[in-house]
């Protein structure tokens, strides 16, 4: 019979993709680099089902996702169209808040403890999730 393609060890398969859930924290840019080195990318959430799947695995923790407006418009790291795609912002978000006093606004998106998305300062250390196609991860 044909050989079944599986996700690498410590990765979880879901709907044709493989997911890796961090247990440590990094700023958004470092998390993004980590995923790239694994031949993956920060998770791109495209449906309620995927949202629930990631939430169930991460639990109520601030978690970086692959959505940023560091280059101006909001963009998913894999090129998925933001404008027409799934969105799950917390009410009132994104708000590009300046009140943190760290300079600039907020340019990176993360899951909040209830799963809704928030924009935050990219250098905050949060957990993260990598995603890649089945058979593509290192």
């Amino acid at each position: 019979g044909s050989e079944r393609i599986c996700c690498p060890i410590n990765w979880v398969e879901y709907e044709g993709s493989c997911y890796w859930f961090s247990s440590s924290v990094k700023p958004w840019t470092e998390a993004d680099k980590y995923c790239q080195l694994e031949n993956a990318h920060l998770v791109v959430v495209t449906s309620w089902e995927e949202q629930r799947f990631v939430q169930q695995h991460m639990g109520p923790l601030n978690t970086w996702i692959g959505l940023t407006d560091q280059n101006g418009p909001w963009k998913w790291v894999d090129g998925t169209d933001y404008e027409t795609g799934f969105k799950n912002w917390r009410p009132g978000q994104p708000d590009d808040w300046y009140g943190h006093g760290l300079g600039g606004g907020e340019d990176c998106a993360h899951f909040t403890t209830d799963g809704h998305w928030n924009d935050d300062v990219c250098r905050r250390p949060y957990r993260w999730v990598c995603e890649t196609e089945l058979g593509k991860a290192n």
Epitope: D69, Q70, N71, G72, P73, W74, Y82, E83, K87, W89, P91, G92, Q93, P94, D95, D96, W97, Y98, G99, G103, G104, G105, D107
Partner: antibody
């Protein structure tokens, strides 16, 4: 195509009022902070006001605080600037622009406000 | 409030020249510095954001550098369409402020 189009400019007497509008298209309006910037004839750019995507945070230049009010209607993809107690020094081209800490892009074509008796 | 200054206020240059414009902030703005180009009767156009990132669609002859309080916009080889006024702007904190502008005209 991402586009911003201002309207509502015109001639008004000192002490009068005017409401500027900015119609946005081609992007998820509610996801972005929006801004008003003005330019007096022959002068440089002056930031006037900013508003966050859900109107939670609003900021004004000292020169317009208490006289101008920025607002937005995300259902209509529209940004507004209500200008009261207008002065001669408010005469300028008013631009709306999208964005925040990563710069303003795009900009509208501008609408001219002239305050004169 | 953060004050922005630019120098020179105007300069004359020829096509092919290397042009450098400087911008200084009255206090540190880390890298929250943006550069715009404006032509007469037109809206400003974003060239560079966060000090050194080239805006999509902007020619690579434009570059930005600097951090803290001192910043530079460089045009490596001036083209006819580059004659315009250039503004820097800080987006570190409110109120946002622009520099007074640098007019680049033909020598």
């Amino acid at each position: 195509e991402v586009q911003l189009v201002e309207s509502g400019g015109g001639l008004v007497k000192p002490g009068g009022s005017l409401r500027l509008s900015c119609a946005a298209s081609g992007f998820t309006f509610s996801s972005y902070s929006m801004n008003w910037v003005r330019q007096a004839p022959g002068k440089g750019l002056e930031w006037v006001s900013s508003i966050s995507g859900s109107s939670s945070y609003i900021y004004y230049a000292d020169s317009v605080k208490g006289r101008f009010t920025i607002s937005r209607d995300n259902a209509k993809n529209s940004l507004y600037l209500q200008m009261n107690s207008l002065r001669a020094e408010d005469t300028a081209v008013y631009f709306c622009a999208r964005g925040g800490s990563r710069g303003f892009d795009p900009w509208g074509q501008g609408t001219l406000v002239t305050v004169s008796s | 409030d953060i004050q922005m200054t630019q120098s020179p206020s105007s300069l004359s240059a020829s096509v092919g020249d290397r042009v450098t414009i400087t911008c200084r902030a009255s206090q540190s703005i880390t890298s929250y510095l943006n550069w715009y180009q404006q032509k007469p009767g037109k809206a400003p156009k974003l060239l560079i954001y966060t000090a050194s990132s080239l805006q999509s669609g902007v020619p690579s002859r434009f570059s930005g550098s600097g951090s803290g309080t001192d910043f530079t916009l460089t045009i490596s080889s001036l083209q006819p369409e580059d004659f315009a006024t250039y503004y820097c702007q800080q987006s570190h904190s409110f109120p946002f402020t622009f520099g007074p502008g640098t007019k680049v005209d033909i020598k």
